[in-house]
């Protein structure tokens, strides 16, 4: 994300096309309050950050409200008046979508349809991961909208589900971040459960007729 300039590494995260976070790691300036200066229009004067992130009492990043969804962030990280890192970046390539909201489950026999509120922008993948205590790893299914149907489930098993949103790489590139996962919810026989047993319960013995 950020090449080194005087040993400065940067990371950019653009939260839900609303807020951009730029953090830096500068070993040479580890005990220095570097300042962050930015603008969204190359013709304007720089503004200084008003919302710094601190680490061990020293500035380590800046949180900014975006002026619009898709824009170039021009920024300069300075030690006093001396720029130690200056760059411009298209912010959308560092998108982190917000976590899915209003997640709902609709059961029909051995299938479940997971829905949530679609985000207001496109080119996203909505991923549902699920597993039962019998599964060694999470299974996954994703769709372009938050309407994901998973078939072939065992009605007798308890399943854990969680959902996240990812930016499509062929649109936003490889430097994006998946959203945080939604809360895990557990379901068995079409009903919500507090949790799924960590160890699978042995099958009930069949009663001889």
């Amino acid at each position: 994300q950020g090449g080194a300039a005087e040993g400065v590494q940067i990371q950019i995260i653009y939260f839900n096309l609303e807020t951009v976070q730029v953090t830096w790691n500068a070993s040479k300036y580890s005990r220095t309050n570097l300042t962050f200066h930015y603008r969204f229009n190359g013709d304007e004067a720089y503004d200084q950050c008003t919302n710094y992130l601190l680490q061990e009492g020293h500035t380590s990043g800046c949180l900014l409200d975006a002026e619009q969804r898709d824009d170039i962030l021009y920024f300069s990280i300075r030690n006093g008046t001396h720029p130690v890192f200056t760059a411009s970046r298209w912010m959308v390539y560092y998108l982190k979508p917000s976590s899915p909201k209003h997640v709902r489950f609709s059961w029909h026999q051995d299938a479940v349809t997971v829905t949530c509120s679609d985000l207001s922008y496109g080119d996203l993948l909505y991923e549902v991961q699920y597993r039962s205590p019998f599964d060694t790893e999470w299974q996954s299914k994703q769709e372009n909208t938050c309407n994901v149907t998973i078939e072939g489930l065992d009605a007798e098993k308890c399943y854990s589900f969680w959902v996240r949103v990812k930016a499509m790489e062929d649109v936003y590139g490889p430097d994006t971040y998946p959203s945080d996962w939604s809360e895990v919810t557990c379901w068995q026989r079409g009903e919500i459960r507090d949790a799924c047993a960590e160890t699978p319960t042995p099958p009930k013995p069949k009663l001889s007729k």
């Epitope: 898709d70 824009d71 390539y93 207001s120 922008y121």
Partner: antibody, heavy 117, light 106 residues
Framework: EVQLVESGGGLVQPGRSLRLSCVAS????????MTWVRQAPGKGLEWVAS????????YYPDSVKGRFTISRDHAKSTLYLQMNSLRPEDTATYYC??????????WGQGVMVTVSS | NIQLTQSPSLLSASVGDRVTLSCKGS??????LAWYQQKLGEAPKLLIF???ILQTGIPLRFSGSGSGTDYTLTISSLHCEDLATYYC????????FGPGTKLELK
């Protein structure tokens, strides 16, 4: 499916004006920058103007600055290019494009503008 | 604004050839470079963006590479349908298209 349909081209005399329109569908128009790109007959592509998604900030190359104005109407999902003081060298096919992260991603079929006396 | 030069301006190649097209910027492009393909009478089509990211539906024989001021589009094995004009485009400082490379059959 993204669709961009340009209109308003034609033959115009040097010094006169013309307004191109581009009707967009298949995507949320106000989420995206929009860009006009032109191509003179037998020549390469030239960026003409861009307008940002919400603030409506505009960008132009020196070749059209002060003569061309890009604008958008969110309610109509329509992009415009007002071209004043037209010159013979403005003769080209003009493409309307949906733009994300600085890149024209989806293109219209183009509309021809001929500036000649 | 950054100026782009493309070489060669005309390239003759045979089906099955490995083809390399070059794009050079007058200053650092910071990997903010895209490649377009344009066939006669058609609108340009985005092939690759941010130097090496292939658009959906573009065959894997197309690839991009480069950094700084120098960038390359490679077609690993030329197909008939690849005959077209190829434009590079930078979006690091303003927006500029290169003059194009016309790819024709030898």
């Amino acid at each position: 499916e993204v669709q961009l349909v340009e209109s308003g081209g034609g033959l115009v005399q040097p010094g006169r004006s013309l307004r191109l329109s581009c009707v967009a569908s298949g995507f949320t128009f106000n989420n995206y920058w929009m860009t006009w790109v032109r191509q003179a007959p037998g020549k390469g592509l030239e960026w003409v103007a861009s307008i940002t998604d919400t603030s409506g900030r505009t960008y132009y190359p020196d070749s059209v600055k002060g003569r061309f104005t890009i604008s958008r109407d969110h309610a109509k999902s329509t992009l415009y290019l007002q071209m004043n003081s037209l010159r013979p060298e403005d003769t080209a096919t003009y493409y309307c494009t949906k733009t994300l992260g600085g890149i024209p991603r989806d293109w219209g079929q183009g509309v021809m503008v001929t500036v000649s006396s | 604004n950054i100026q782009l030069t493309q070489s060669p301006s005309l390239l003759s190649a045979s089906v099955g050839d490995r083809v390399t097209l070059s794009c050079k910027g007058s200053q650092n492009i910071n990997n903010y470079l895209a490649w377009y393909q344009q066939k006669l009478g058609e609108a340009p089509k985005l092939l690759i963006f941010k130097t090496n990211i292939l658009q959906t539906g573009i065959p894997l024989r197309f690839s991009g590479s480069g950094s700084g001021t120098d960038y390359t589009l490679t077609i690993s094995s030329l197909h008939c349908e690849d005959l077209a004009t190829y434009y590079c485009y930078q979006f690091n400082n303003g927006f500029t298209f290169g003059p194009g490379t016309k790819l024709e059959l030898k």
